[in-house]
């Protein structure tokens, strides 16, 4: 009897969709694998006999639930399916966005950039999916522990009147309001200020 | 149910032009998005272009950038492809797509109406 794989699972993060499990000990040798989706209420192959562990299912529709299932192969012989249940649109994960600061005296230039998507035309982003797509920023003064949030309204945002010479770091996630789904954070970016705007008398 | 058909496909000179229109039989094409797709001989079918009704957004697959430009006009319900310095490597079958969701543009998997194609030649 072959047994079947382990922790099957879908890691999908805007809609780079990997199906993954785990080789179960097994002492005849090595196993293969085959992982196939439900398509018009008939399993078509994804991955036929393949050694690897995951699987490739982004061109999978974003919209609607799918059936995805993978079993484990020895000669002729092979184990049960595990199925899992898959809807892009509301289990991808939201990556990170992009973001380019710039910094103009005591002010901090923000430009966000929606996350790409996989199989998409270059300028089709994760805002194009999603209708109610918003930004969450949170910024600190370097050093310290208290975090201020905004939501833009915008791609941009600017934050003005900081304290010259001094560090803050910023970092920004994609938010669905209507879904009260928020993404990943991406990266802090730490930038100086330098002297404040203001003409002395 | 909805019919997608395709008109202005032909034979055209290296460099030239041509025009593809796509009509809903009979409905409007008030689609979330509407996009076109082509299948060279021997080819997989490939994303051209697309365009979102939420902001009318347009979005082009790089092989065409800045030659194809997609249009709509919602008077006579009807999406265009303007092709233009045409290559031998347009050569193909070109289809119009609508999706009911809108949530992808380019992946044919997120498409649920189709036509029956119009054949474009580019060759001298």
């Known amino acids: 009897m072959v047994p079947p794989p382990e922790n099957v699972r879908m890691n999908s993060v805007n809609f780079k969709n990997i199906l993954q499990w785990e080789s179960p000990a097994f002492a005849k040798g090595n196993l293969t694998f085959t992982a196939q989706y439900l398509s018009y209420r008939i399993f078509q192959d994804k991955c036929m006999n393949t050694t690897l562990t995951e699987c490739d299912f982004s061109s999978l529709s974003k919209y609607g639930d799918h059936t995805l299932r993978v079993r484990a192969e020895f000669a002729d012989e092979h184990s049960d399916w595990v199925n899992i249940t898959f809807c892009p649109v509301d289990d991808t994960i939201i990556g990170p966005p992009g973001m380019q600061v710039e910094v103009l005296a005591d002010s901090l230039h923000m430009r966000f950039l929606a996350p790409k998507i996989e199989n998409e035309y270059e300028t089709w982003t994760m805002k194009n999916v999603y209708n109610s797509w918003t930004y969450n920023v949170q910024y600190w003064k370097n050093g310290t522990d208290e975090k201020f949030q905004i939501t833009p309204q915008y791609d941009f945002e600017v934050l003005r009147n900081l304290e010259p010479w001094t560090t803050y770091c910023v970092q920004v996630r994609g938010f669905l309001p209507d879904r009260n789904k928020a993404g990943e954070w991406s990266e802090p970016v730490c930038e100086q200020t330098t002297h404040d705007e203001t003409v002395p008398s | 149910e909805v019919q997608l058909v395709e008109s202005g496909g032909g034979l055209v000179q290296p460099g030239g032009s041509l025009r593809l229109s796509c009509a809903a039989s009979?409905?409007?094409?008030?689609?979330?998005?509407i996009g076109w797709f082509r299948q060279a001989p021997g080819k997989g079918l490939e994303g051209v272009s697309c365009i979102s009704a939420s902001d009318a957004s347009t979005h082009y697959a790089e092989s065409v950038k800045g030659r194809f430009t997609i249009s709509r006009d919602n008077s006579k319900n009807t999406l265009y492809l303007q092709m233009n310095s045409l290559r031998a490597e347009d050569t193909a079958v070109y289809y119009c797509?609508?999706?009911?969701?809108?949530?992808?543009?380019?992946?044919?998997?997120?498409?649920?109406?189709w036509g029956q194609g119009t054949q474009v030649t580019v060759s001298s």
């Open positions: 009979g409905n409007s094409l008030d689609y979330p998005t």
């Open positions: 797509a609508a999706s009911l969701h809108g949530l992808g543009c380019k992946s044919e998997a997120d498409y649920d109406y």
